[in-house]
């Protein structure tokens, strides 16, 4: 089982220093600041699932040097920043979505010896990201469709 921690209060102070190794902001309808970094130097697991996020501002994650698992499931992501994707040791947990194509390509080109990248469908089943992209995301489809949400149901 994955580790877990209790959801933080909905009123998040982004200026606060978080000392925990796990932070759970799941389902809080958060809007992540674009010009501010989360202050959580110990965090290894960050749960941002179910927040309606369309993007992951790279500045927000800039100081999370210990981060190992980033859960962004159930967010309508339209893009994943290249600088975030290039963090080879970061385990991104995200919905199967054509917007992950850039993440997949950057990992493939910059990160050696990686385990296969996974994504999750609407039934919470895991899929190989490469296979999903191949089947569900024709060339140019992700950028042409805005949010790029093309779930592959099995």
């Amino acid at each position: 089982l994955e580790p877990s921690c209790t959801v933080s209060s909905a009123d998040v102070d982004w200026n606060a220093e978080f000392s925990a190794t796990c932070l759970n902001f799941s389902g809080l309808s958060l809007s992540l600041p674009h010009n501010q970094s989360l202050r959580a130097s110990n965090v290894i697991l960050l749960d941002l699932s179910g927040n309606g996020l369309r993007e992951l501002p790279v500045t927000f994650f800039a100081h999370l040097q210990k981060l190992e698992v980033l859960n962004v499931l159930r967010n309508p992501l339209s893009r994943v920043d290249g600088a975030l994707a290039a963090r080879c040791d970061l385990d991104l947990q995200a919905d199967c979505n054509c917007a992950l194509e850039s993440w997949h390509d950057i990992r493939r080109d910059n990160c050696s010896g990686q385990k296969p990248l996974l994504c999750w469908d609407t039934t919470s089943s895991q899929h190989n990201l490469s296979a999903f992209l191949e089947v569900s995301c024709a060339p140019g489809l992700a950028s042409a469709t805005g949010s790029g949400h093309h779930h592959h149901h099995h």
Epitope: L1, P3, C5, T6, N42, L45, K66, E68
Partner: antibody
């Protein structure tokens, strides 16, 4: 096979500086997520976490001892060092180093999977 | 600091019985709790991590459960080789802290 082995002076006098070495093999402390902690245990008592050093040389200390602790590592020789200044009889204990691994399958956990056998330190005048 | 309180301090059981050790955290630590077994004159060995995950090679008679503040280590069908001290520890927040231990004796 992952192993860790602590070494120290055995006996020292109050007010002296305790220098401990953790020599390890079977893993690299330059691997992302990897780390080593020092934990001590007075005879017949519980465990007390002292300090942790990360792969990137970042360090965390127990606030109750922070002013007396200095943690360092030599990645190339697979060693971690802990110095405790101004020791007292209360520092008499068995000192362990333990590894925190990076779990690539189901990450985000934090635990100590391998411990050294420990080195006994006695502070006595 | 987060205080981890273990109970009982010691217990004596017969071979084949079921043992339940408890650990209570002074504040919510999610599932960031591990259990360690320490036999006489030996270093601690990892049994359970993430509150309920059995570590590699640990017999399946050892089971961990709980979250937030209340955690349990259960040993079903206790064996003579289970004679040891058992420590719980939290890694949710620095400084990491351990319980004072439970000594398991075998009748």
């Amino acid at each position: 096979q992952v192993t860790l082995k602590e070494s120290g002076p055995g006996i020292l006098q109050p007010s002296q500086t305790l220098s401990l070495t953790c020599s390890f093999s079977g893993f690299s402390l330059s691997t992302s997520g990897m780390g080593v902690s020092w934990i001590r245990q007075p005879s017949g008592k519980g465990l007390e976490w002292l300090a942790h050093i990360y792969w990137d040389d970042d360090k965390r200390y127990n606030p109750s001892l922070k002013s007396r602790l200095t943690l360092s590592k030599d990645t190339s020789s697979n060693q971690v060092f802990l110095k405790i200044t101004s020791v007292d009889t209360a520092d008499t204990a068995t000192y362990y180093c333990a590894r925190r691994p990076r779990d690539y399958y189901g990450g985000g956990h934090w635990y100590f999977d391998v411990w050294g056998a420990g080195t006994t330190v006695t502070v006595s005048s | 600091d987060i205080v981890m309180t273990q109970s009982p301090k010691s217990m004596s059981m017969s071979v084949g019985e079921r043992v339940t050790l408890t650990c209570k955290a002074s504040e919510n630590v999610g599932t960031y709790v591990s259990w360690y077994q320490q036999k006489a004159e030996q270093s601690p060995k990892l049994l359970i991590y993430g509150a309920s995950n059995r570590y590699t090679g640990v017999p399946d008679r050892f089971t961990g459960s709980g979250s937030a503040t209340d955690f349990t280590l259960t040993i079903s069908n206790v064996q003579t080789e289970d004679l040891a001290d058992y420590h719980c520890g939290q890694s949710y927040s620095y400084p990491f802290t351990f319980g004072s231990g439970t000594k398991l004796e075998i009748k």
